[in-house]
């Protein structure tokens, strides 16, 4: 007779990342008896929900249930039925919902209420939906990448997780770029964090970490573009906006009502003599870069050093993992550069050439890429360079310490894993005691 495999003693967890532009569902799995070990939780599935972010459902909340169905059903398939009732489900909403809440707390509550109703109808252990703070988003992203890189483990590893992993236990900083906000989080070197709002203290696996974090609301790539358009249309002589951040020959009509819908453009709002205007691309990297820099107020700093808008930023320290849109955009340019490892100077040179290429040529060269994304790569790439170099003060040298990361050991870099690890109490404050053989079954 055949030997029957013993049922796996594993646990599962689900986190939904309700971002400003879309929602993604992540399924995590870990060996039940190794919950407190570092690096044992891994992602088994990502399901991208079809449609926009949940904040866009404010006028059609009755569609939220259907919107979430496919990915929740996928979770039902992936996770064994016997595990459903003990599988926690968490939904965290980020800057898109923070912005909606700024406009109307009642409308944000309405969306979250329907999300909770919809998710609680599944057989999992639903643990609630909430809008996470920018500080949490930064902190959990930092925890995720360092957990996956094995930085919290006191065990010396004889293998390298990722090609660029340094063998020491110095943590990586985290750079996260979303659609509506961007986060910078790292452990500064013996530096006092001058602003208490930006200081976090963690004790993880027996070690203390003093972490700096800040989330810049409205400086995600989509909201930054809205800001730039709102700023530039102020000085346009008519309803034509000649825009250096789009390719020559590119044209797009924008509704003024859409432009002023977001709280991010309020500071640039003015009464315009037209309801629509047309973006006409002129494709000039240098001018685009200059226009983007005007979004960063660097004239005021009440601290020893600032990023922009008067926000304290300590001197940069160590290696950084840049993920989410930082990765997606730079991964596109890596393909444009035929996969060569690119220095900051090379990226800048490539951006100049790329932005200057005519739109018709770009569409032909990258026919497999959705036009909405393709049309915005010139802006997004320029914005990333501006944010990292002028916003966060990376230099040509420190640029070499930025690692654009999509996944680490098969798990997406992002805040969701850190969020789940925290809520399921899977990161102990002290280093767990382990028997000599406790790690023999996995690496």
């Amino acid at each position: 007779t055949q030997n029957k495999a013993l049922p796996e003693n594993v646990k599962y967890g689900i986190v939904l990342d309700a971002g400003s532009s879309h929602t993604s569902l992540y399924i995590y799995k870990w060996p039940a008896e190794k919950e407190n070990d570092t690096g044992v939780v891994h992602q088994v599935e990502e399901c991208r929900v079809k449609g926009p972010g949940i904040s866009k459902f404010v006028q059609k909340v009755n569609e939220i249930g259907i919107y979430l169905t496919d990915c929740m059903e996928r979770a039902r398939e992936v996770i064994p039925r016997s595990q459903h009732q003990e599988t926690p489900v968490y939904l965290g909403a980020t800057a898109g919902m923070r912005l909606l809440r700024m406009e109307s707390e009642e409308l944000a509550d309405r969306v979250l209420d329907v999300v909770e109703r919809s998710l609680s109808n599944y057989p999992f252990d639903f643990q609630g939906a909430r809008i996470i703070t920018g500080q949490e988003e930064g902190a959990y992203g930092w925890i995720t990448i360092n957990y996956l890189l094995g930085k919290f483990s006191q065990k010396t590893r004889w293998f390298s997780i990722v090609p660029y992993e340094t063998n020491n236990q110095e943590t990586f900083g985290a750079l996260d770029l979303g659609g509506a906000s961007t986060q910078v989080t790292f452990v500064p070197q013996n530096q006092t964090i001058e602003s208490p709002d930006n200081a976090l203290q963690f004790r993880l696996y027996g070690k203390d970490y003093n972490v700096y974090t800040h989330s810049f609301l409205c400086y995600g790539k989509d909201q930054a573009l809205w800001q730039k358009l709102a700023k530039d249309i102020q000085v346009a002589s008519n309803e034509i906006l000649r825009d250096p951040c789009f390719h020559p020959g590119y044209k797009k009509v924008v509704n003024v009502s859409d432009l002023y819908k977001t709280p991010c453009t309020k500071r640039f709002e003015m009464t315009l003599p037209f309801q629509q205007f047309e973006i006409q691309g002129i494709g000039n990297y240098q001018q685009c870069h200059q226009s983007i820099l005007e979004l960063f107020n660097t004239s005021y700093c009440p601290y020893s050093q600032c990023a922009f808008n008067g926000i304290f930023l300590p001197p940069l320290q160590g290696d950084f993992g840049a993920f989410s849109a930082f990765y997606f955009v730079m991964d596109f340019f890596k393909k444009v550069a035929k996969n060569s490892v690119i220095s900051q100077e090379k990226v800048t040179e490539m951006m100049k050439k790329f932005c200057a290429q005519p739109w018709e040529e770009i569409k032909t060269s990258y026919a497999g890429v959705k036009e909405k994304y393709l049309s915005e790569y010139c802006f997004s790439g320029t914005y990333i360079l501006s944010l990292l170099l002028q916003g966060y003060h990376f230099t040509a040298d420190s640029w070499e310490h930025i690692h654009f990361i999509g996944k680490i050991q098969g798990s997406d870099a992002g805040w969701t894993l850190g969020y789940m690890l925290n809520l399921t109490n899977m990161i102990p404050a002290e280093q767990p005691l382990s028997t000599p053989l406790s790690h023999s079954t996995y690496v």
């Epitope: 909340v61 249930g65 909770e116």
Partner: antibody
Amino acid sequence: QVQLVQSGAEVKKPGSSVKVSCKASGGTFSSLPISWVRQAPGQGLEWMGGIGFGTANYAQKFQGRVTITADESTSTAYMELSSLRSEDTAVYYCARGGAKYAGRYGMDVWGQGTTVTVSS
Amino acid sequence: GIVMTQSPDSLAVSLGERATINCKSSQSVLFSSNNKNYLAWYQQKPGQPPKLLIYWASTRASGVPDRFSGSGSGTDFTLTISSLQAEDVAVYYCQQYYLYPLTFGGGTKVEIK
């Protein structure tokens, strides 16, 4: 001032269905969820489910047997319970609120209750 | 779901004396985003629907006398009637509205000694 008025008492046979209505007056019907709570004779309160902004959800115990709907045009919510058994004999209440977000003040307005008796 | 456990099942208190009812939830109902506890207390008199007394664990609903007060946070909550009146004879229920399914405690019957 919002008021919830429920339909009258019902006597039903085992295996049949009952549909209880809850009409709101004096306020915006769509602004808060409506919960349905039942109370068997001499027993405590038991949440059955609720509806808010077009989305219903139900306690696991009643899943598949209860349907909660709302008609905004008449400001009326409905609770239909099928495959009735004698244990379903209870007073059924509708109440405004109860959700973490949209009903953040608890269930602040209650209907007068509808007695449903299930007997052969 | 979250299990709500009330104690005692019944309570006999002299008029003018203090009555204390406890409620324990199987998991925290404290919402970190706004630091509020999603817990309500209801009073139910015979033949009547329940009446909301307290929401957010400690906020009195409109028209509720100030002898009723709620306290506690996380998983442990208390309803206190500082000076029992004859009209306070009723069954009292706690309820969490932090997560679906919404759940009630089993109830505490308050009588006059």
